[in-house]
């Protein structure tokens, strides 16, 4: 099942995904697409990296982190209701059927009538059922809904969502990431 992420209309949506390169600078191609991950590649590609850099990019879709260190999280700017749906983060590991695929469900809610603060900076967590992540845009609050039972591959996407908490460091240190090689 997909991990669910939420944002309001007009906010930025943040979809976390990362892997651990086998060696510094030894990157693997990554693609982000709209729609569930197909058997190969990404459908409706919105952003793509190769072994060195971003090589395909579309308006409003940005790599959010230090992708050269394996943080290939995606930011979608100024979302609309049409941005709702499943997004695929595909880590294209060389070899037959070696790819790591993550399907992330983005739910866009209508904007609240009451004005929100300009930037939410505090990490708060009523763990384990509800998480609110630090904002990355104007008037942005992103909330994960009730979390399903999480396996290690899902943790690899969640860990980056929690990157500002001690838990994030613990997850990384414990190896709860996709390691290449």
């Amino acid at each position: 099942s997909e991990v669910e992420y939420r944002a309001e209309v007009g906010q930025n949506a943040y979809l976390p995904c990362f892997y651990t390169p086998a060696a510094p600078g030894n990157l693997v191609p990554v693609c982000w697409g709209k729609g569930a991950c197909p058997v190969f590649e990404c459908g409706n590609v919105v952003l793509r990296t190769d072994e060195r850099d971003v090589n395909y990019w579309t308006s409003r879709y940005w790599l959010n982190g230090d992708f050269r260190k394996g943080d290939v999280s995606l930011t979608i700017e100024n979302v609309t209701l049409a941005d709702s749906g499943i997004y695929c983060c595909r880590i294209q590991i060389p070899g037959i059927m070696n790819d790591e695929k993550f399907n992330l469900k983005l739910v866009i809610k209508p904007a609240k009538v009451t004005p929100a603060p300009t930037r939410q900076r505090d990490f708060t967590a009523a763990f384990p059922r509800m998480l609110t992540t630090r904002g990355h845009g104007p008037a942005e609050t992103q909330t994960l809904g009730s979390l399903p039972d999480i396996n290690l591959t899902q943790i690899s996407t969640l860990a980056n969502e929690l990157r500002d908490s001690r838990l994030a460091n613990d997850l990384r240190d414990s190896g709860a990431t996709i390691r290449i090689g």
């Epitope: 930025n12 510094p24 600078g25 952003l47 850099d53 971003v54 990019w57 308006s59 409003r60 940005w62 790599l63 959010n64 982190g65 230090d66 992708f67 050269r68 260190k69 930011t75 700017e77 100024n78 990355h136 845009g137 104007p138 990157r163 500002d164």
Partner: antibody, heavy 122, light 108 residues
Framework: EVQLLESGGGLVQPGGSLRLSCAAS????????MSWVRQAPGKGLEWVSA????????YYADSVKGRFTISRDNSKNTLYLQMNSLRAEDTAVYYC???????????????WGQGTLVTVSS | SYVLTQPPSVSVAPGKTARITCGGD??????VHWYQQKPGQAPVLVIY???DRPSGIPERFSGSNSGNTATLTISRVEAGDEADYYC???????????FGGGTKLTVL
């Protein structure tokens, strides 16, 4: 050819205001995060502020937060820095710099302007 | 907050190899970028993402990054390499760009 040209610097009294501009050319301006970086006389580089490609998100160094405002006009390919409540310690050469492709924050500064000098003194 | 530490100065004879370090807590987990700045001029990117070289930068410039130290290496140093060198990272915890204090490279 990528070009960044700053303007608007000058002498201003403490507590005063100044607006810097950076005219960009040679690339698709809205596709890149942009930053302002300053350098006080004889000192090192200090990042001041950054703005995402759409202008939707802005970031500030603690030393200028609440006093400086970064903005951009993508239709004019121009980056701005509104500086209010200026202090003597804001005296510096201010550079505008372009971030890297496809990244929200810019990550590094690929191209720099030649800078404009801001002097805050009574 | 995160701090980047550079030696204030490094001296090297022409033709020799200069190494400029940039220290930071687990800096190997971050991408490090290096800039060269000559007097009266704007900075120029010489290394990005730890070890990549922009077009136009000589192969004599190289970079590495692991553990708590990133290093800019300039081999076969020339008089024209004399400049200030700055390391830089993006600190995602604060959403701030950080520079090291700078290192003045003197060619003897």
């Amino acid at each position: 050819e990528v070009q960044l040209l700053e303007s608007g610097g000058g002498l201003v009294q403490p507590g005063g205001s100044l607006r810097l501009s950076c005219a960009a050319s040679g690339f698709t301006f809205s596709s890149y995060a942009m930053s302002w970086v300053r350098q006080a006389p004889g000192k090192g580089l200090e990042w001041v502020s950054a703005i995402s490609g759409s202008g939707g998100s802005t970031y500030y160094a603690d030393s200028v937060k609440g006093r400086f405002t970064i903005s951009r006009d993508n239709s004019k390919n121009t980056l701005y820095l509104q500086m209010n409540s200026l202090r003597a310690e804001d005296t510096a050469v201010y550079y505008c710099a372009r971030g890297s492709y496809g990244t929200y924050y810019g990550n590094y500064f690929e191209y720099w302007g030649q800078g404009t000098l801001v002097t805050v003194s009574s | 907050s995160y701090v980047l530490t550079q030696p204030p100065s490094v001296s090297v004879a022409p033709g020799k190899t200069a190494r400029i370090t940039c220290g930071g807590d687990n800096i190997g987990g971050k991408s490090v970028h290096w800039y060269q700045q000559k007097p009266g001029q704007a900075p120029v990117l010489v290394i990005y993402y730890d070890s990549d070289r922009p077009s136009g930068i000589p192969e004599r410039f190289s970079g590495s990054n692991s553990g708590n130290t990133a290093t800019l290496t300039i081999s076969r140093v020339e008089a024209g390499d004399e400049a200030d060198y700055y390391c830089q990272v993006l600190d995602r915890r604060s959403d701030h760009f950080l520079f090291g204090g700078g290192t003045k490279l003197t060619v003897l």
